[in-house]
């Protein structure tokens, strides 16, 4: 499965859409910065078989979809941009699921690293908790948008490493 050829363009479009989503100047939000504890080690891609790396990417995109599908999110972001965002995420999820199916039986290792999946879920739980504590303020959403853009950029690096493993 040549994942990045079908996937990296969509990843770039996702980042471009997120860059356009800002509603307020982030310069007013410095004090709201927060350490969400991005699980960098889960995206280093060294300890993974390919199928496990794909499952981690899938979980991150699925959690991002969930985060931006809430009514609080809909009330914050431009509806047209959100729709484009959902479309790109949905495309990426489909690509990853197709890839996972092709990996069945190719490797002896499990398709999923449960610990890694849980680590990604806990990361998104921390983001959700932060938004709740900040009462979904515009600045809190700006901080989260910046964090998700960063995590997407870092996940793109994992995809590049996967391509070199082909």
């Amino acid at each position: 499965c040549d994942l990045p050829q079908t996937h990296s363009l969509s990843n770039r479009r996702t980042l471009m859409i997120m860059a356009q989503m800002g509603r307020i100047s982030p310069f007013s939000c410095l004090k709201d910065r927060h350490d969400f504890g991005f699980p960098q080690e889960e995206f280093d891609g060294n300890q993974f078989q390919k199928a496990q790396a794909i499952s981690v990417l899938h979980e991150m995109i699925q959690q991002t979809f969930n985060l931006f599908s809430t009514k609080d999110s809909s009330a914050t972001w431009d509806e047209t941009l959100l729709d484009k965002f959902y479309t790109e995420l949905y495309q990426q999820l489909n690509d990853l699921e197709a890839c996972m199916m092709q990996e069945v039986g190719v490797e002896d290792t499990p398709l999923m690293n449960v610990d890694s999946i849980l680590t990604v879920r806990k990361y998104f739980q921390r983001i959700t908790l932060y938004l709740t504590e900040k009462k979904y303020s515009p600045c809190a959403w700006e901080v989260v948008r910046a964090e998700i853009m960063r995590s997407f950029s870092l996940s793109a690096n994992l995809q590049e490493r996967l391509r070199r493993k082909e």
Partner: antibody, heavy 121, light 107 residues
Framework: EVQLVQSGAEVKKPGESLKISCKGS????????IGWVRQMPGKGLEWMGI????????AYSPSFQGQVTISADKSISTAYLQWSSLKASDTAMYYC??????????????WGQGTLVTVSS | DIQMTQSPSSLSASVGDRVTITCRAS??????LNWYQQKPGKAPKLLIY???SLQSGVPSRFSGSGSGTDFTLTISSLQPEDFATYYC?????????FGQGTKVEIK
């Protein structure tokens, strides 16, 4: 390797205009803000302002608002600091530095080498 | 604007000494404080960010502490290459502001 490379030293006369540059490489230029810092001879560091190269949004220190203009051209990964009419008191070393924006990461972790601006009649 | 005040403005110390520099903010800045080292003719170099996080590549003899309004930079055992000027900087709000600097000189 992350680098910020600034344009060379400038010698100008009072009243002249000037635009100095800061070119970023080795990282995603639009993922970080670029700040400008002044250091007058024998003095400390003063923050002048900052730009988000992704959309050219800017913020200035009140001390420098209206005195300088910060801009960026993301197509060539370059930020600029410009004056329309220099004064002798603008004589200083000017540094650019990258800032992680709203991400939880080190502030001003990479700096340019500095551009010395001398304004004298 | 948030004012940052460093003390002392200069100090003399010997190689091997433990050196402490303090920085006080005019209002609470939580842990949004950075420390920089600058040598003559060179650009500043980030040492500590978010009050106590050691920047990658910086020797472990440097450490930072504090929160709210009072912060400290400590050099546990001063080395010859540590003679420089040190600046604190708040990063909680614009305008970003620096302390006036502390020059560490050879005794």
């Amino acid at each position: 390797e992350v680098q910020l490379v600034q344009s060379g030293a400038e010698v100008k006369k009072p009243g002249e205009s000037l635009k100095i540059s800061c070119k970023g490489s080795g990282y995603s230029f639009t993922s970080y803000w670029i700040g400008w810092v002044r250091q007058m001879p024998g003095k400390g560091l003063e923050w002048m302002g900052i730009i988000d190269p992704s959309d050219s949004d800017t913020a200035y220190s009140p001390s420098f608002q209206g005195q300088v203009t910060i801009s960026a051209d993301k197509s060539i990964s370059t930020a600029y600091l410009q004056w329309s009419s220099l004064k002798a008191s603008d004589t200083a070393m000017y540094y650019c530095a990258r800032h992680p924006g709203l991400n939880w990461a080190p502030d001003f972790d990479y700096w340019g080498q500095g551009t010395l601006v001398t304004v004298s009649s | 604007d948030i004012q940052m005040t460093q003390s002392p403005s200069s100090l003399s110390a010997s190689v091997g000494d433990r050196v402490t520099i303090t920085c006080r903010a005019s209002q609470s800045i939580a842990e949004f404080l950075n420390w920089y080292q600058q040598k003559p003719g060179k650009a500043p170099k980030l040492l500590i960010y978010f009050a106590s996080s050691l920047q990658s590549g910086v020797p472990s003899r440097f450490s930072g502490s504090g929160s709210g309004t009072d912060f400290t930079l400590t050099i546990s055992s001063l080395q010859p290459e540590d003679f420089a000027t040190y600046y604190c900087q708040q990063s909680i709000d614009f305008p970003l502001t620096f302390g006036q600097g502390t020059k560490v000189e050879i005794k």
